[in-house]
């Protein structure tokens, strides 16, 4: 039975050109994490394998950095980065756990509108 839960950084609103950290944390299970995949829509961004370490997809190498921990750092944000990001934890013996984070990247002109938030 899958007893674990995924906690995420929560949704993030950021400004174009900035950088953000996406993180997930798996709790309430003793299952072993064998691999964590980071995906956006149907695109694979990065893999962190327990044995082989990190692999960043070639198309994201310039703007995606591994960590901290099992998280992912996105740099030089563009409006095109707006979308849903998935952390997919492959575990044994539980199976797969998935967390979801929505990233909203705003043009500077929009970000200023009513801004009383900390903009990453």
């Amino acid at each position: 039975m899958m007893t674990g839960t995924i906690e995420t950084t929560g949704n993030i609103s950021a400004e174009k050109g900035g950088s953000i950290i996406l993180q997930c944390h798996l709790s309430s299970t003793t299952a072993q994490v064998t691999q964590v995949n980071w995906e956006q829509q149907d695109q694979l961004l990065a893999i962190c394998n327990a044995d082989l370490g990190w692999h960043i997809s070639p198309s994201f190498k310039d703007r995606v950095a591994p960590g901290p921990g099992l998280g992912l750092t996105l740099q030089s944000l563009t409006v095109n980065d707006t979308g849903e990001y998935f952390c997919i934890y492959h575990t044994y013996p539980d199976g797969t756990y998935t967390g979801r984070i929505f990233l909203e990247v705003l043009e500077s002109s929009v970000a200023e509108h009513g801004a009383r938030f900390q903009i990453p």
């Epitope: 995420t8 950084t9 929560g10 949704n11 993030i12 609103s13 953000i20 950290i21 993180q23 829509q41 409006v79 095109n80 707006t82 979308g83 849903e84 979801r100 984070i101 929505f102 909203e104 705003l106 043009e107 002109s109 929009v110 509108h113 009513g114 009383r116 938030f117 900390q118 990453p120």
Partner: antibody
Framework: EVQLQQSGPELVKPGASMKISCKAS????????MNWVKQSHGKNLEWIGL????????SYNQKFKGKATFTVDKSSSTAYMELLSLTSEDSAVYYC??????????WGQGTTLTVSS | DVVVTQTPLSLPVSFGDQVSISCRSS???????????LSWYLHKPGQSPQLLIY???NRFSGVPDRFSGSGSGTDFTLKISTIKPEDLGMYYC?????????FGGGTKLEIK
Amino acid sequence: EVQLQQSGPELVKPGASMKISCKASGYSFTGYTMNWVKQSHGKNLEWIGLINPYNGATSYNQKFKGKATFTVDKSSSTAYMELLSLTSEDSAVYYCARGLRFSLEYWGQGTTLTVSS
Amino acid sequence: DVVVTQTPLSLPVSFGDQVSISCRSSQSLANSYGNTYLSWYLHKPGQSPQLLIYGISNRFSGVPDRFSGSGSGTDFTLKISTIKPEDLGMYYCLQGTHQPWTFGGGTKLEIK
């Protein structure tokens, strides 16, 4: 002035599909997300999901995955939500709403959907 | 999914009253950057819902200052300082920090 103009009420048969439109004006259509909300029984509000008109990225409430599909036509600043395999449970008022920082700033007038044979 | 519980379900008032509506979430609504995406809406009969407050306490443009929001973490409050006839209707809170976004069940503000 920001305006979201939705298509009119619909009466459809069970099993059919239908598409609601939401025409945006008064702002840059691609600069904000477009959200869809369901209101059942005149009370409960449910977030169906959103689409980012800039790149077509979508996010769905899992409850509505396979039920709702979002698209946009940037040339006419119009967002669409198609509802599939309709049942009486889908009878409701559906709203489009412009999103910013995970709140719903401006709402359309609502589209009433009645599913009945 | 994050469960958002709103109280009370119904709030009978007289014009001029001050009232509070509570919204509680099943987990913290602060993201890793310290931003909390909790907003409040008023839905009047025959109209579309309208945004009152976003980010816990920021009044949306054109919203009178008799409306105020407060709270943190999992506990949030909407206060209306002097009830006017145009304030009657259903009030909803919405959390947008976690996927999927979830609404509270609503509070009906009505005349005693």
